[in-house]
């Protein structure tokens, strides 16, 4: 009669490498008497005998994973016990190897020149695949504008016309290579002013010719605006050559004015515009004109149309080359980001941003912008948009938007004048103010924002007021 013998594992488990969808086997040879009971665990969790993904044979000494999955990675142990002595255990790792697979391939992209393009290419594989990109027939070389991100995506900063073309991503590891399908990057060129009209300081009754040239695909059209209205007098001559339009406006000067050249072209259903302005001043007014950092004009844009007071004069900052266009572009860039913020933050932020970027203006001899009152800025920053503002400050940006977006500057509340010191020195935001006659919901700014989805703010109920709180920073 055989003597009882405690189990001994004669073939310890080893690390097994396996490809996805292949078979992987662990061998656990055991000597003992009587015959041991052998159980298997994965990551310390018992593998059930009836689990159809596994086959356990040879009295439990052979564990086979019938079709390896990515999630089967882990430590597998066999435990043998026959009641004589203690149970014995041996463990080994399963490393799932996987040929490269592109899980999120790139897609066709249309992008405006100067913006940032990101072509996605998310991959799977073990070992982790390296990702490279091909443009046309050549490997794409990275530079200060073009980078392959950690995720595999291709990021192109400041997209140029020459970036247009066909791209594909390539994922490669020791087991193989995967290619995405070819995708097209199309670069659209918005209307752009090549030569802005020049400002003139002339004597009363002079003739002046203002010249404006613009480029774009398709060729833009040019129109002229005088002090916010269509030009009422003067003659216009135009010529087009190599996608460049040249427009000349001849004027007889009897009063000073602000003349804006507007270049427009169409991209699908959307229009792009570029603006450039020039002042024509009469000689004896020149000193006061020089002191001005900008000019007052009616707001003619779209984004802030429902937020700003109707027909109000707003300040356009001439430190921008094309003030009206630049300020409208800034607010336009930000607008879509506001869709992501909370329902109380959004209308408050819209009111703040529009009134900060297009400040109320006192024309006078030197046009003067009127900043927002500190109390209203703080209401947005600390009450209505606290989460968004904190996230923004956490990224050390001064804007309401996520890192990587075109950041719109927001005012530094602490530097703004208080309405309690001098109520005439700053602008109140009616949307954040208490006025009994106010409407009860915010007006719909764009068709993508129905008024039914805009909640009340203090402005809009008869219950609230920005109050004289004096403990300000």
């Amino acid at each position: 009669e055989k003597l009882p013998k405690a189990p001994v594992i004669t073939t310890p488990l080893e690390t097994v490498d396996a490809l996805v969808e292949e078979v992987a086997t662990f061998m656990c040879a055991v000597e003992s008497y009587p015959q041991p009971e052998i159980s298997w665990t994965r990551n310390k969790i018992l593998i059930k005998l009836f689990d159809t993904r596994y086959s356990i044979r040879e009295n439990g000494q052979l564990l086979t994973i019938l079709s390896v999955e990515d999630s089967d990675d882990g430590i597998y142990c066999c435990i043998a016990n026959n009641g004589v002595g203690g149970a014995v255990e041996s463990c080994g790792a399963l490393q799932v190897k996987m040929k490269p697979k592109i899980t999120r391939p790139p897609i066709n992209v249309k992008i405006i020149e100067g913006l940032k393009a990101v072509l996605p290419c998310t991959t799977m594989g073990n070992p982790k695949p390296s990702v490279s990109w091909i443009k046309g027939d050549n490997a794409l070389r990275e530079n200060s504008r073009i980078a392959v991100l950690e995720s595999g995506s291709l990021r192109i900063h400041n997209v140029q016309k020459e970036d247009a073309g066909q791209y594909r991503c390539v994922a490669k590891n020791s087991l193989g290579t995967a290619y995405s399908k070819l995708v097209k990057l199309e670069v659209e060129v918005f209307a752009r002013i090549l030569r802005a009209p020049e400002s003139h300081n002339v004597t009363f009754g002079s003739f002046v010719t203002l010249r404006c040239t613009a480029i774009g695909i398709p060729v833009p059209t040019i129109s002229w605006i005088e002090n916010g209205n269509a030009v009422s007098s003067g003659s216009i001559q135009e010529s087009v050559k190599d996608r460049v339009i040249d427009s000349r406006l001849q004027l007889f000067i009897t009063k000073p004015g602000l003349y804006t050249c507007i270049a427009t072209n169409k991209h699908g259903e959307k229009f792009s515009t570029a603006k450039a302005a020039a002042t024509v001043s009469i000689a004896e007014w020149s000193k006061s004109q020089k002191d001005s950092q900008g000019y007052c004009a009616q707001y003619r844009g779209e984004v802030c149309d429902a937020v700003l007071a109707k027909d109000a004069l707003v300040f356009f900052n001439t430190s921008y080359r094309d003030p009206e266009d630049a300020q409208e572009l800034l607010i336009h860039t930000a607008w879509n980001e506001l869709k992501a913020v909370s329902p109380l933050c959004r209308p408050a932020a819209e009111a703040l941003l529009c009134n900060h970027l297009f400040q109320e203006c006192s024309p006078g001899v030197v046009p003067t912008p009127m900043p927002i009152c500190r109390e209203y800025c703080l209401a947005v920053k600390e009450l209505f948009c606290a989460k968004e503002w904190q996230a923004m400050e956490g990224k050390a940006h001064r804007g309401l938007y996520r890192s990587g977006m075109h950041l719109l500057p927001v005012p530094e509340c602490s530097k703004l004048p208080s309405m309690h010191r001098d109520p005439t020195a700053c602008t109140r935001l009616p949307y954040l103010d208490y006025k009994k006659e106010n409407i009860t919901t915010f007006p719909s700014i764009t068709s993508s924002r129905p008024s039914a989805d805009i909640p009340n703010l203090p402005a809009s109920t008869s219950s609230f007021a920005v109050s004289p709180a004096y403990s300000m920073t």
Partner: antibody, heavy 119, light 113 residues
Framework: EVQLLESGGGLVQPGGSLRLSCAAS????????MSWVRQAPGKGLEWVSV????????YYADSVKGHFTISRDNSKNTLYLQMNSLRAEDTAVYYC????????????WGRGTLVTVSS | DIVMTQSPDSLAVSLGERATINCKSS????????????LAWYQQRPGQPPKLLIY???TRESGVPDRFSGSGSGTDFTLTISSLQAEDVAIYYC?????????FGQGTKVEIK
């Protein structure tokens, strides 16, 4: 320990004044917007006022506007409610509450202080 | 202002049984841009201040037992206590924070039968 502790309640005649205080501890007081919420005896909750973290912006319910003033002293971690021209309908337990960052629900409440306006 | 209406005003439930409280808002508190409902639930035990239970209509505040759950969207919401315990005797309030001013329901008193 995160807590709010109100004080300053009591009996006052109609037309009189009272100043409530709320001492905060255990959280960053100067970055938290704070509110007062009241509860008349046997009744529900009514929001009264809010003040931003810096104290630079305040809002009031219509029922108290003009005779209540909310303020704060961040150096003392203390919130105040100055109540003037008190009326019988201002009788209530006044709770100080911390407003959730960016949203207008209240994640921390004090135990409350009773204000009774009666002649 | 958005008006919040709770039903019933009071209910008596046996220990271990389910308690259901309803809350209706006079206008939707669902914000379509982020698909969130701006609604909170509070518990006020006798002689105690209110305590936040649930926000975003269904997210439990940390430390709140999982027998409390919130559901609903738009204008109709429910607070459910799946198995009533003795310590759940309290008044429960709903509150909208979709628009200013924040407004509360009139409260629902929960007692043991």
């Amino acid at each position: 320990e995160v807590q709010l502790l109100e004080s300053g309640g009591g009996l006052v005649q109609p037309g009189g004044s009272l100043r409530l205080s709320c001492a905060a501890s255990g959280f960053t007081f100067n970055s938290s917007a704070m509110s007062w919420v009241r509860q008349a005896p046997g009744k529900g909750l009514e929001w009264v006022s809010v003040i931003s973290g810096s104290g630079g912006s305040t809002y009031y319910a219509d029922s108290v506007k003009g005779h209540f003033t909310i303020s704060r002293d961040n150096s003392k971690n203390t919130l105040y409610l100055q109540m003037n021209s008190l009326r019988a309908e201002d009788t209530a337990v006044y709770y100080c509450a911390k407003k959730e960052l960016g949203d207008w629900y209240f994640d921390l409440w004090g135990r409350g202080t009773l204000v009774t306006v009666s002649s | 202002d958005i008006v919040m209406t709770q039903s019933p005003d009071s209910l008596a439930v046996s220990l271990g049984e389910r308690a259901t409280i309803n809350c209706k808002s006079s206008q939707s508190v669902l914000y379509s841009s982020n698909n969130k409902n701006y609604l909170a639930w509070y518990q006020q035990r006798p002689g105690q201040p209110p305590k936040l239970l649930i926000y975003w209509a269904s997210t439990r505040e940390s430390g709140v037992p999982d027998r409390f759950s919130g559901s609903g969207s738009g204008t109709d919401f429910t607070l459910t206590i799946s198995s009533l315990q003795a310590e759940d005797v309290a008044i429960y309030y709903c509150q909208q924070y979709y628009s200013i001013p924040p407004t509360f329901g009139q409260g629902t008193k929960v007692e043991i039968k």
